[in-house]
Interface confidence: medium
């Protein structure tokens, strides 16, 4: 009804003598803002109809005081009972210690103003601690994760309990193998109160039938326990035996497969056999109860491998361990592997003999071009530095205690090397003359792989007519030595070949050896004919003066040079190829003025009144720089020019005239020349 209280707590609370009970409790009064005034806890209560009051043993009684209307009721302890609630909504209680005779109904009487409520709370207190419960799944399978739950409908703060797990009396902890986790939890709510431990693990098939125990402990003392037995379902467990495990070809082998255990049991024993993971078919089998026999009569090498057997129950197929059957046989036909191939000359090469054999081959014979190589009996043949000599076909024979194999396949060792013995050959007629065309051929002795290209040095020295042939169109006198390279994947260069081009002497010139300065008449003069190069080196020298041959020899000598020796001189050098003329070299002899002569124009007899020009003619080198004129009395006429002009002439001008000439070398004087001035007809007429 509207004035009903709502009170929530667990239906029944469980405990045992000496423990405690905590009663989680929540309430709501009919009036929203009402507060508890009084709380009573009865034991074995009854309602007195006469007094209309509840009677019984009071375990707890608390009332709000008038002095402090707001004072709280909680955390007050009376005897064994502690009120852990409040005046609004919490009515939690704790009884410690609890007695077996506390079993039955408690009455919780609550008053809030005019509103009252009596709430029955049922306690089940046993004399001894009760057993925990164990929950487990209906089916447990090997290696599959399973969770077991151990629980107890009890929890009370101040009386701690511990749940421990045991497998066959050995404690299980979180570090036990195959255990995933152990988790404990305590629940204390208005719905229920319990303590639980969950054990998650992966059972092995060998755990089948083993006991699992959950133990309740308080202060290291065992209070109670419960034991269950594990029913682990697992696939059949099979045991395989091979006799013998090592057998020679053509002998027989028996394999047995026994079913040692299965849960659930096998309906029928149907054993399957597998080799290297594949089912075996068409084999002779003998099936017995819990056992199967596989008989291999005449073993071949293909029968070697890993064998196992399989049988199934409702859980699934169970497999035995794998057992290896070794079949011994003589080596199989061999083949050779070469690393690297092709090989580079000078490289390290390894040849490996591949031949299946059981037991492994112990001895190997190596062959090069079908000839045995003594001394090396290993599976690997190593050539530290391979040379073209090592090229060829290699094979090997493997041997074990059962015999030796055959040669299946030879391997070819190809040794690559750069072209060998490369030479540059001149194909033209010799000697080669300047301006000739020259053909050069690049030759080599051997190459692997074949030569694919050629190179020439210096580059661009000619045109390539075809691979390995170079044409130099017009060879110069100073042609560089030419070298060629023949190339496959590597290039080999020939030594440079000198073309030895023949040419006429070059850069011929005249050198003045002495004197060091200008040449003056009477001095000793020595000229030398010089040139830069000549091939062939044997030469002859010739001298020409003004185009005419003068003499042969390297030097041209003048004991006392005279002005008549002046002129253009050429030096000429020749060898067997040709001759080369130097540029003209002008010999200039310096001398003082000589052969001075006075010439009179228009003549040496001139009429008075006319004009006469006297010229001082001479031979001088360098030319005369200063002239001096004298009359018959030796008087200096103070005229410094080459010409002396007399105008107008007078009879007194008659007489002899001389001139003197001076240059940087010296002075020369002319003999006198006579000028006769005669009277004009006018003058004669006057007289």
């Amino acid at each position: 009804s509207a004035n009903d209280w709502t009170v929530d707590h667990p239906q029944t609370l469980f405990a045992w003598e000496g423990a405690c009970i905590r009663i989680p409790c929540k309430y709501k009064t009919p009036l929203p803002k009402a507060r508890l005034d009084n709380i009573l806890l009865f034991q074995n209560y009854e309602f007195d109809k006469a007094t209309k009051k509840f009677t019984g043993t009071v375990l707890y009684n608390a009332t709000k005081t008038e002095k402090d209307p707001e004072s709280e009721l909680y955390l007050s302890k009376q005897g064994r009972v502690t009120f852990l609630g409040n005046r609004i909504d919490n009515c939690t209680l704790k009884i410690h210690p609890i007695r077996a005779n506390d079993s039955g109904n408690l009455g919780l009487r609550m008053t809030a103003g005019t509103e009252r409520w009596m709430e029955p709370i049922h306690l089940n207190v046993s004399e001894k601690p009760f057993q925990p419960y164990i929950q487990m799944p209906s089916e447990i399978r090997e290696s599959q994760s399973v969770t077991l739950t151990c629980g107890l409908n009890f929890s009370c703060f101040g009386y701690d309990i511990l749940l421990k797990w045991f497998l066959e009396d050995s404690e299980i902890t979180s570090i036990t193998s195959s255990v995933t986790s152990i988790t404990s939890s305590v629940t204390s709510s208005i719905k229920n109160v319990y303590t639980e431990s969950k054990l998650t693990f992966q059972p092995k098939w060998t755990d089948h039938g083993k006991s699992v125990k959950c133990q309740v402990q308080h202060s290291s003392k065992v209070l109670s326990e419960r034991t269950v037995r594990l029913d682990v379902k697992y696939t059949p467990k099979l045991e395989i035996k091979v006799n013998p495990t090592e057998v020679e070809k053509n002998n027989s082998v028996t394999m047995t497969c026994r079913v040692n255990s299965s849960n659930p049991k096998l309906r029928t024993v149907a054993v399957s056999w597998f080799k290297d993971g594949r089912p075996l078919e068409d084999q002779e089998l003998e099936q017995e109860q819990q056992m199967s026999k596989l008989i291999l009569h005449s073993v071949t090498k293909d029968m070697r491998g890993k064998y196992r057997c399989q049988a199934s129950n409702d859980i699934g197929p169970g497999e035995s361990e794998e057992v290896e059957l070794t079949v011994h046989y003589a080596p199989e036909p061999s083949r050779v592997h070469i690393y690297p191939s092709p090989a580079e000359e000078g490289q390290s090469v390894e040849l490996i003999c591949e031949s299946l054999a059981s037991p492994s081959a112990t001895n190997y014979t190596w062959y090069h071009n079908r000839k045995p190589i003594p001394g090396d009996t290993q599976e690997k043949l190593r050539i530290p530095k391979v040379s073209p000599w090592h090229a060829g076909n290699y094979s090997c024979l493997a041997e074990n205690r059962l015999g030796h194999g055959k040669i299946d396949q030879e391997a070819k060792l190809d040794v690559h090397y750069a072209p060998k013995a490369v030479t540059t050959v001149i194909q033209s007629f010799t000697p080669i003359l300047e301006g000739d065309s020259v053909t050069l051929v690049c030759r080599y002795n051997s190459s692997n792989p074949d030569v694919t290209s050629y190179r020439w040095n210096p580059q661009g020295s000619g045109s390539v007519l075809k691979p390995g042939v170079l044409r130099i169109q017009k060879v110069t006198w100073d042609s560089m030595p030419v070298s060629c390279a023949a190339c496959n994947h590597k290039c080999s260069w020939a030594l440079p070949v000198i073309l030895n081009v023949h040419y006429a002497p070059r850069d011929v010139k005249v050198l003045k050896v002495s004197p060091a300065s200008e040449i003056r008449a009477g001095q000793r003069v020595l000229l030398q004919c010089d040139f830069a190069e000549s091939n062939p080196a044997e030469v002859r020298f010739f001298w020409k003066k003004n185009g005419s041959l003068v003499q042969e020899g390297r030097y041209l000598s003048f004991g006392s040079v005279s002005p008549e020796d002046s002129g253009n001189y050429n030096c000429m050098v020749n060898n067997s190829i040709g001759e080369t003329l130097s540029q003209a070299w002008n010999l200039q002899v310096l001398y003082a003025p000589r052969r001075l002569r006075v010439s009179i124009s228009p003549g040496d007899h001139v009429m008075e009144g006319k004009k006469a020009t006297l010229s001082c003619e001479s031979d001088a080198n360098p030319p005369i720089s200063q002239y001096t004129w004298f009359d018959s009395s030796g008087q200096d006429l103070h005229s410094s020019g080459q010409k002396l002009r007399l105008e107008p002439l007078e009879v007194q001008h008659t007489g002899s005239y001389r001139c003197k000439g001076t240059n940087g070398i010296g002075t020369g004087e002319s003999p006198p020349s006579t000028l006769t001035v005669y009277y004009s007809p006018e003058t004669i007429g006057k007289r």
Epitope: P372, G375, W389, G392
Partner: nanobody
Framework: QVQLVESGGGLVQAGGSLRLSCAAS????????IGWFRQAPGKEREGVSC????????YYADSVKGRFTISRDNAKNTVYLQMNSLRPEDTAVYHC???????????????WGQGTQVTVSS
Amino acid sequence: QVQLVESGGGLVQAGGSLRLSCAASGITSDDYAIGWFRQAPGKEREGVSCMYSSDGSTYYADSVKGRFTISRDNAKNTVYLQMNSLRPEDTAVYHCAAGPWCFVTGVGREEWGQGTQVTVSS
């Protein structure tokens, strides 16, 4: 080009000794085999003795073991075959050969010389 020139052959009485020389030139490989084989008229070629240049290891045909010794002089590029206790069946043309391997039948992929005649009289 490899050139091998043999010398030292001749006529000798049974039980006598001879020393054959082989002057080698033009071998460019660091690791090669050099040795002797012989050929008697109408018979197959037979390897006599061989040695490797790299380590000096030697090989002998069973018929000459203990009687013949192969040696070399690196400075002179010469290989020698000292033949003691000669027998009439040792009569043959002895060739010097060079190649990559020592073989029972001689030297593989050979370059060989003209040979020198050895005659053992009884």
